[in-house]
């Protein structure tokens, strides 16, 4: 039996179709293709005869198709008028015709789509952020990529206004990174340049590792000791020191040479993230003896959180 | 006292390279990041990059990448910037300064400045 | 790169007058901004960090203020030792940028 196959059945605009026929019959002399579900000759495309390979064109020819001897027929640079149903006939020697009809959707091409934001430097844990993909465009689905891999499911994602828009609620530090939208019709699909999502956060309650000599929690009069300090913050927060309430200097490392019973006291570090508006800090008392006992670093320390 | 010492000034060629130091004293060579800053006469100030002296990373500036070179030799308490294939527009003066703190701090100690003149 | 625009580019003023310079950040700096001084042929000095925030020995009237993308230096009263050219700069990470400096000048 005759049937018609369109390769591809969903045609993006511009692109071009192919009307492929197959089990042709063995007696024919030529063929009709028309517009629409039924032989008119106000419809006919382009008639064909095989003995003299010559094409003819009909009222309904725009000069975008071509007929091939296999009845096959191309039509490039397609329109979404072009939607809907094509019929063949093909004349056979007994004049007893056959005929076919096939059908293609034609959708428009996808422009790139955008992504604008409301926020792309939230702070966590305070701010919102909301994605919107644009421009809108009808019968289009939308997707959303996050560095790479489709939406993970979480309470904290919303997405709305037919997925165009994405909602971040309460940004987390692990929200940050690559977003792009993507649009897409039957036929085609089209994705959005990235954009980088910066979340704002810490700085956290530091941490002090006793880098010290000799080793331990021990400190012994004469000992280098080495307090080295890190708070998890975006931007990398401002790191202080205060032994003894005394503003000291404004390094991660706080370096003493050659200790003394002179240095006990409580050794704060202080962190601070202007971006986010917040500051923390860790508070360890050190005890140096003058001989061979050895006491040490209060390792239960004070933990000062501020907004 | 915080001190940064820079060598001396320096008239070079166009197409030559010119290696300037800067020598810190008065505090923990290794705990504060250094930079440079260069002013060409009558002009503004222009950052150039900076190097870690505790690691050696350094990050230059856009401009002078591929131009620029910084090291730090920690036995002596220096470091060095080179800047190769000079032109004209190089004539400046060339700061050393010390970052006030670890991270997002401005610069709180300078060289007093080695003037490169590049001249044929 | 972040963009930083400082005006006037000069000014002129009598001694004791309050006098005030502006930046601008192409970018939010959250805070992150410094003022350096430099008076002529002499190597900058910093004045004020963290957009407020005074150097130690920096007399008091000088004060720094301003958030997000505009900043003020304010001097409350000008004395002649504070002719020199003022520049801003933004600290929050590299690449630095500096702003093309403010020239103060007495009447």
């Known amino acids: 039996k005759l049937t018609i196959e369109s390769t591809p059945f969903n045609v993006a605009e511009g692109k071009e179709v192919l009307l492929l026929a197959h089990n042709l019959p063995q007696n024919r002399i030529g063929y009709s293709w028309y517009k629409g579900e039924r032989v008119d000759g106000n419809s006919l495309i382009v008639g064909y005869v095989i003995g003299t390979q010559q094409a003819t064109p009909g009222p309904a020819y725009s000069g975008r198709e071509t007929i091939y001897p296999n009845a096959s027929l191309l039509i490039q640079n397609v329109t979404q008028n072009d939607t809907g149903f094509y019929t063949l006939q093909v004349i056979k020697s007994d004049l007893v015709n056959e005929e076919a009809t096939g059908q293609f959707h034609v959708y428009p091409e996808l422009p790139k789509p955008s992504i604008s934001s409301n926020n792309s430097n939230p702070v966590e844990d305070k701010d919102a952020v909301a994605f919107t993909c644009e421009p809108e465009v009808q019968n289009t689905t939308y997707l959303w990529w996050v560095n790479g891999q489709s939406l993970p499911v979480s309470p904290r994602l919303q997405l709305s206004n037919g997925n165009m828009t994405l909602t971040l609620l309460s940004v987390k530090r692990n929200d940050a990174g690559s977003y792009e939208c993507e649009i897409q019709n039957p036929a085609s699909a089209n994705r959005s340049d990235p954009v980088t999502l910066n979340v704002l956060y810490g700085p956290d309650v530091p941490t002090i590792s006793p880098i010290i000599s000799p080793p331990d929690s021990s400190y012994l009069s004469g000992a280098n000791l080495n307090l080295s300090c890190h708070s998890a913050s975006n931007p990398s927060p401002q790191y202080s020191w205060r032994i003894n309430g005394i503003p000291q200097q404004h390094t991660q490392v706080l370096f003493i040479a050659k200790i003394t019973p002179n240095n006990n006291g409580t050794y704060a570090c202080f962190v601070s993230n202007l971006a986010t508006g917040r500051n923390n800090s860790i508070v360890k008392s050190i005890t140096v003896s003058a001989s061979g006992t050895s006491p040490g670093l209060s390792a239960g320390a004070h933990h000062h959180h501020h907004h | 006292q915080v001190q940064l010492v820079q060598s001396g000034a320096e008239v070079k060629k166009p197409g030559a390279s010119v290696k300037v130091s800067c020598k810190a004293s008065?505090?923990?060579?290794?705990?504060?990041?250094l930079h440079w800053v260069r002013q060409a006469p009558g002009q503004g100030l222009e950052w150039i990059g900076y190097?870690?002296?505790?690691?050696?990373?350094?990050s230059y500036a856009q401009k002078f990448q591929g131009r620029v070179t910084m090291t730090r030799d920690t036995s002596t308490s220096t470091v060095y910037m080179e800047l190769s294939s000079l032109r004209s527009e190089d004539t400046a003066v060339y700061y050393c300064?010390?970052?006030?703190?670890?991270?997002?701090?401005?610069?709180?100690?300078w060289g007093q400045g080695t003037l490169v003149t590049v001249s044929s | 790169d972040i963009q930083m625009t400082q005006s006037p580019s000069s000014l002129s003023a009598s001694v004791g007058d309050r006098v005030t310079i502006t930046c601008r950040a192409s970018?939010?700096?959250?805070?992150?901004l410094a003022w350096y001084q430099q008076k002529p042929g002499k190597v900058p000095k910093l004045l004020i960090y963290?957009?407020?925030n005074l150097v130690e020995g920096v007399p008091s009237r000088f004060s720094g203020s301003g958030s997000g993308t505009d900043f003020t230096l304010t001097i409350s009263s000008l004395q002649p030792e504070d002719v020199a050219t003022y520049y801003c700069?933004?600290?929050?990470?590299?690449?630095?940028?500096f702003g093309q400096g403010t020239k103060v000048e007495i009447k």
């Open positions: 300064a010390r970052e006030y703190g670890n991270y997002n701090y401005p610069l709180d100690y």
């Open positions: 008065g505090y923990i060579f290794t705990s504060y990041y």
């Open positions: 190097i870690n002296p505790q690691t050696g990373y350094t």
């Open positions: 970018e939010n700096q959250y805070g992150y």
């Open positions: 963290n957009t407020k």
């Open positions: 700069q933004h600290h929050l990470g590299t690449p630095y940028t």
